[in-house]
Amino acid sequence: LEVQVPEDPVVALVGTDATLRCSFSPEPGFSLAQLNLIWQLTDTKQLVHSFTEGRDQGSAYANRTALFLDLLAQGNASLRLQRVRVADEGSFTCFVSIRDFGSAAVSLQVAAPYSKPSMTLEPNKDLRPGDTVTITCSSYRGYPEAEVFWQDGQGAPLTGNVTTSQMANEQGLFDVHSVLRVVLGANGTYSCLVRNPVLQQDAHGSITITPQRSPTGAVEVQVPEDPVVALVGTDATLRCSFSPEPGFSLAQLNLIWQLTDTKQLVHSFTEGRDQGSAYANRTALFLDLLAQGNASLRLQRVRVADEGSFTCFVSIRDFGSAAVSLQVAAPYSKPSMTLEPNKDLRPGDTVTITCSSYRGYPEAEVFWQDGQGAPLTGNVTTSQMANEQGLFDVHSVLRVVLGANGTYSCLVRNPVLQQDAHGSVTITGQPMTFPPE
């Protein structure tokens, strides 16, 4: 006997009614007196509801189930589950027996939407740039466990220090509390998004913090306009300066370096003390120059992943900030050239010349030229693949018909360093082999 149930789980909101669909194809002349229908929990085999000997035997499941009795004769064996609870989640087996028997299992996925998050800020008064605050996002009575995301006002993810806890109440519904610990910038919006993964429902909460300003006006912070270019593996200085007033002491200074986009803390100096690197222990301040207004940051052993914008944030009586861009670069190796085929070559043969250059950054520009430096606009395919450090290996393939002889040059240009790496191959005489013997 073939029994049909939906393949996908039935999603039901807590407190609502759910229909677990199940059907069979009755033969002509079928009567309900011949039907044995049993619904049970798949795992424990606990009886949920049954219909035997032409009669509804009723619910064995907290009196919350019912059959569609007027539809049974047409093969509708579906079960109605009322006032769904979290504990109902799981697999239910629909077992149908007439002359023969068959069964199938349907999954019930329970869900409950999360409430609009409430946001709390601690401390919540007398806030200054450079202060560390704790923002708590609380959302209640959802199911299943939520996914929590923090974002800034532009929707960029905040990767500060986040601790999320989820606690089930006696009904099995979750209360979620997510705590973001963040260093305040000039001002900012902090948003919390609580996602129900089953309902694909997002509940949003946000808080905007505007720190206290001084009547005496902002601190002017200077950084270079152009990006700072640094070679992978070397050290880079992100320059930043301010003009200290007479009588200025380091005890009054809050200096924060953070990633502009994610607000991730990089390095800080507060209340007269270097708080150290929060960035893989690769940053340092010029402590002996701070009192003169030099707030520059030294970034050691530069990696491709460091590329981006860094904000230098200075707070004394008031605050100011400016962003400096770090452009990472790595020179490309001298190209190696390969020729295929490389034996018994004749004019008119089509050959493939491959130019390979390694471990550069950013992506290269590749040009092919003949011996006179004129561009070769043959069939060129260039691929660039980043390795685990983010450095690119470039492979450029020129497919060309051989003339009587010729030089084929490949130029791999690093667009940031304006550095060109050259490779060339010369094919002469015929018949010929490569490399020449």
Partner: antibody, heavy 116, light 107 residues
């Protein structure tokens, strides 16, 4: 509501040490610095130092650097101040107070009496 | 350390009278000054911060003013429950330092 609970009194001998406690409730303990303040009878207030319960970073008034040691127990939301080599000069009321620049909640204070 | 000088050390005022207490600092602290009230046998309570911001729940007869090195606390229309010692405190630098206190009594 926010509460900072401190024992009412401690009596200790000269030369001994004492560990004063301050149990916080009604707020996120790790979100606020905890300060300690000394007040001698009919005298002013002296800031001893403070601790960040989040990572136990401390700042001390130089006058108390060799006298006081601040610690926290995050699991019980309790801040502690250990005072060592006690003399009669250390007899005072010691308050805990939360905050960075403003101390918006204070404990009731522990009266420390150093006497033989 | 920043020195805090508070005056007067004590004063008595009649109910309904206006009272002014001043606080001077040894260096410019911008506006980072707070005022606290301490009643006999009790712990101090925050009245005003940032020189002029009234803490929640504090009666509006209290007000603060000043910036730089000169600050004052004013009580418009003294009430019996205002009998207390008042302290100023700078929050500009570490260590935090307090004024010596002004003991205010009812006449």
């Amino acid at each position: 509501q926010v509460q900072l609970q401190q024992p009412g009194a401690e009596l200790v001998r000269p030369g001994a040490s004492v560990k004063l406690s301050c149990k916080a409730s009604g707020y996120t303990f790790t979100a606020y610095w905890m300060n300690w303040v000394k007040q001698r009878p009919d005298q002013g207030l002296e800031w001893i130092g403070r601790i960040d319960p989040y990572d136990s970073e401390t700042r001390y008034n130089q006058n108390f650097r060799d006298k006081a040691r601040l610690t926290v127990d995050k699991s019980s939301s309790t801040a502690y101040m250990q005072l060592s080599s006690l003399t009669s000069e250390d007899s005072a009321v010691f308050y805990c107070a939360r905050g960075v620049r403003i101390f918006d909640y204070w404990g009731q204070g522990t009266t420390l009496t150093v006497s033989s | 350390d920043i020195q805090m000088t508070q005056s007067p050390a004590s004063l008595a005022a009649s109910v309904g009278e206006t009272v002014t207490i001043t606080c001077r600092t040894s260096e410019n602290i911008d506006y980072t000054l707070a005022w606290y009230q301490q009643k006999p046998g009790k712990s101090p309570q925050l009245l005003i911060y940032n020189a002029n911001t009234l803490e929640d729940g504090v009666p509006s007869r209290f007000s603060g003013s000043g910036s730089g090195t000169h600050f004052s606390l004013k009580i418009n229309s003294m009430q019996p429950e205002d009998t207390a010692t008042y302290f100023c405190k700078q929050a500009y630098d570490v260590p935090r330092t307090f004024g010596g206190g002004t003991k205010l009594e009812i006449k």
